[in-house]
């Protein structure tokens, strides 16, 4: 009889453990933000991209905040950050100002408490996009593991924003917490 009670107690304890694990997982911060194509800056200079979706299509956010074009960390921890930026041009959309392009992405961390800004990751290449080619495409993907503190902000800068691919599966960035800071 006592064996049966112990087994039942273990099952209850186990399910509580699962529930606790699950609720902890559900509280794990993550964000996947996709480009807002209605508000992409023009030109070829380096700009900060401030318009991103956080709640439509593939875009989702939980236990993080998106404000003023920046992804804000709400919990200290080690996070995996990633960004995918696609550049494209088709001749029917106009001409290129120059055939020699520097196509770049910069993932930047800004700290409000100690005002400072650091480039965490950058990627890209110089490209020759001939005016005689009908279509051009180039993709950059960067990712890395970073210690982030509550209140720190992540933002994205790109060169040649007018060449950004506006699709949600092309231009996006995100983060998810992997573990606590010991």
């Amino acid at each position: 009889g006592s064996q049966h009670i112990r087994a039942e107690k273990a099952m209850v304890d186990g399910s509580w453990l699962d529930l606790a694990k699950r609720s902890k997982l559900e509280a794990q911060p993550f964000a996947h933000l996709t480009i807002n194509a209605t508000d992409i800056p023009s030109g070829s200079h380096k700009v900060s991209l401030s318009s991103w979706y956080h709640d439509r299509g593939w875009a989702k956010i939980s236990n993080m905040t998106f404000s003023n074009g920046k992804l804000i960390v709400n919990q200290d921890g080690f996070y995996y950050l990633y960004a995918n930026i696609c550049f494209r041009h088709h001749e029917t959309s106009g001409d290129l100002a120059t055939e020699y392009l520097q196509l770049m992405v910069y993932v930047t961390k800004t700290s409000i408490k100690i005002p400072s800004s650091h480039t965490l990751m950058k990627g890209g290449s110089t490209k020759y996009w001939s005016g005689n080619s009908e279509f051009h495409f180039y993709s950059i993907n960067v990712g890395g593991f970073f210690k982030l503190r509550s209140g720190e902000e992540i933002s994205i800068e790109v060169s040649n924003p007018s060449l950004l691919d506006p699709d949600q599966d092309a231009t996006y960035f995100g983060a998810f917490k992997v573990r606590d800071i010991d």
Epitope: S42, S44, E91, T92, G94, D95, A97, S130, N132, S133
Partner: antibody
């Protein structure tokens, strides 16, 4: 629809300068090269050069490098061509033009006649 | 610079007959699998009008009696059955390479 409206005819003295204008409408002015073409009376077409109005990049045929200066005013969606040190050889109709969505010059201004005469 | 040589310089064709104009480039105007050669029609006192782009593509609104062919250095504009309104000067143009250049023109007269 795409339209290119050019300024009126010019009568100029030898050695003087003229500035021709071309106002674009019906498309985003800063996303296409705007070209200029010369045609002397009874003669063929000559490509002068082009300007990309966004950053103001320019390209010229060698023989027009010292003759023509291309500029653009983004806020007015207007391109300009200044011709300096005018001679009788500069008497011609000057067209501004833009390529089509694929290729080839599909859109032309009505042309500006420049007459150089003492 | 790429030099475009048109022939003949002038052409007289009877109404309903075929007209053929040739344009030869001093070097290839092909790149990325396309031929960057275009054809224009110009009537007196008017701006040129694009007929054919990329060697063989008919511009919207242009009658189907106009056609273009060729690649690399040799190109042809054909009017299958000439009509009275086709009397004009015809120019070829390349934009494969800066500076863009035009042919000297072919004047078509209708008999």
């Amino acid at each position: 629809q795409v339209q290119l409206q050019q300024s009126g005819a010019e009568l100029a003295s030898p050695g003087a300068s003229v500035k021709l204008s071309c106002k674009a409408s019906g498309y985003t002015f800063t996303t296409y090269w705007l070209q200029w073409v010369k045609q002397r009376p009874g003669q063929g077409l000559e490509w002068i050069g082009a300007i990309y109005p966004g950053p103001g990049n320019t390209k010229y045929t060698q023989k027009f490098k010292d003759k023509a200066t291309l500029t653009a005013d983004k806020s007015a969606s207007t391109a300009y061509m200044q011709l300096n040190s005018l001679t009788s050889e500069d008497s011609a109709v000057y067209y501004c033009a833009r390529r089509g969505s694929r290729r080839g010059i599909a859109y032309w201004g009505q042309g500006t006649l420049v007459t150089v005469s003492a | 610079n790429i030099v475009l040589t048109q022939s003949p310089a002038s052409l007289s064709v009877s109404l309903g007959q075929r007209a053929t104009i040739s344009c030869r480039a001093s070097e290839s105007v092909d790149s990325y699998g396309r031929s960057f050669m275009h054809w224009y029609q110009q009537k007196p006192g008017q701006a040129p009008k694009l007929l054919i782009y990329l060697a063989s593509n008919l511009e919207s609104g242009v009658p189907s009696r106009f056609s273009g062919s060729g690649s690399r250095t040799d190109f042809t504009l054909t009017i299958s059955r000439v009509e009275a309104e086709d009397a004009a000067t015809y120019y070829c143009q390349q934009d494969n390479e800066d500076p863009y250049t035009f042919g000297g023109g072919t004047k078509l007269e209708i008999k």
